[in-house]
């Protein structure tokens, strides 16, 4: 007799979910030699642990402790990029900027990168069926409960000048629900934060407006200062011209031609 | 338009140290590259150091480890410390200012001297 399984509203496991975990672990702390001493073994279990065998919609950050425990990482403070609805090009970004780092930089936010997890209460399978989706199922779901805390523990070792670039292109630049919105912004430390500075991606080639100028970015501008850390504000209107900009700093549309 | 005011050059012993600062102003909305460059008398304008935020920053050889440039965006202002300075320093800086991220043309201050005497 097959066993009733529940439907989620979203997506299932990636396929192959715990072989990608693995292969990715090996590979980053191949390519990163501070962090050679990871047992990608051991991460792989503490990764299992936080949601198998536990009802998908009851996960909490503290099942995740063993993972988090493993996968501390020390990045420079001062040289954190946050994103918002801008996934690409800020990882495009640091590709070129190498001694800058975003979430997905870290051990634990390359591993879990766009993959989908989740598992079913008393039993050691893992769902690839389906997973509960965070606004039509529950909140407390394995990948966001993931996300917010890997992404509270980012947010809360930055310090000096943060920097996030968010898309110009949305109906809110700035969204108070998204994870750098919900989450990030508010664990910011202002002991040790001086700048948040927004970096607003225009998607318009010929769009000149100064969005720094939106409501949706006052707003961030509100709650950063109420935070008692000062708030700055840039355009970048063509983002292909920044990232030339970026790759080659000796390029004549780049610097000041004498 | 944007305006560009200079401050902090003068006369310094061979070793000492200095902080130029350069704030700009008017209409400012797009990420932009600050810096500085110098010229000797009877030499060339030659490039010191330009910075378009945090980390990313670019010196020239003769001048790195000795000369650090910072940015404070919310402000627009840059500034240079030079320490361990070197006679072969003294010049006229001059701060210059582009926005890089659409085509803008490039606007530079009148210069500040600096004189490094042995």
């Known amino acids: 007799v097959p066993r009733w399984r529940q439907q989620w509203s979203g997506p299932g496991t990636t396929k192959r979910f715990p072989e990608t975990v693995l292969a990715r672990c090996v590979k980053y702390t191949e390519i990163h030699p501070e962090m050679r001493h990871v047992d990608c073994q051991s991460v792989w279990d503490a990764f299992k642990g936080a949601f198998i065998s536990k009802h998908p919609c009851n996960i909490t950050e503290e099942d995740y402790q063993p993972l988090m425990k493993l996968g501390t990482q020390t990045v420079p403070c001062n040289k954190i990029l946050l994103w918002s609805r801008i996934k690409d090009l800020a990882h495009q970004f640091t590709q070129v900027q190498r001694d800058m780092f975003t979430l997905e930089d870290t051990l634990l936010g390359y591993l879990a990168d766009d993959l989908t997890w989740c598992g079913e209460f008393n039993t050691s399978k893992i769902n690839y069926q389906s997973c509960p989706d965070w606004r039509k199922d529950c909140s407390n779901n394995p990948v966001s409960v993931f996300w917010k805390t890997v992404s509270r523990r980012f947010a809360e070792a930055a310090c000096d000048v943060v920097h996030v670039m968010l898309n110009g292109s949305r109906s809110k630049i700035f969204d108070k629900n998204s994870t750098f919105g919900s989450v990030e912004v508010h664990n910011l430390q202002p002991e040790k934060v001086q700048t948040l500075e927004a970096w607003v991606i225009h998607g318009g080639r010929e769009d000149s407006r100064d969005l720094c100028q939106d409501p949706t970015i006052k707003e961030l501008e509100s709650i950063i200062s109420k935070r008692n850390i000062q708030f700055s504000c840039k355009n970048i209107y063509r983002p292909d011209k920044f990232l030339q900009c970026v790759k080659n700093p000796e390029d004549s549309s780049c610097t000041s031609e004498i | 338009q944007v305006q560009l005011v200079e401050s902090g050059g003068g006369l310094v012993h061979t070793g000492g140290s200095l902080r130029l600062s350069c704030a700009a102003s008017g209409s400012i909305s797009g990420l932009n590259t600050m810096g500085w460059y110098r010229q000797a008398p009877g030499k060339q304008r030659e490039l010191v150091a330009t910075?378009?935020?945090?980390?990313?920053?670019r010196y020239a050889d003769s001048v790195k480890g000795r000369f650090t440039i910072s940015k404070d965006n919310a402000k627009n202002t840059v500034y240079l410390q030079m320490n361990s300075l070197k006679p072969e320093d003294t010049a006229v800086y001059y701060c210059t200012f582009k926005e890089i991220t659409r085509d803008s043309r490039s606007y530079w201050g009148q210069g500040t001297q600096v004189t490094v005497s042995s």
């Open positions: 910075i378009i935020s945090g980390t990313m920053t």
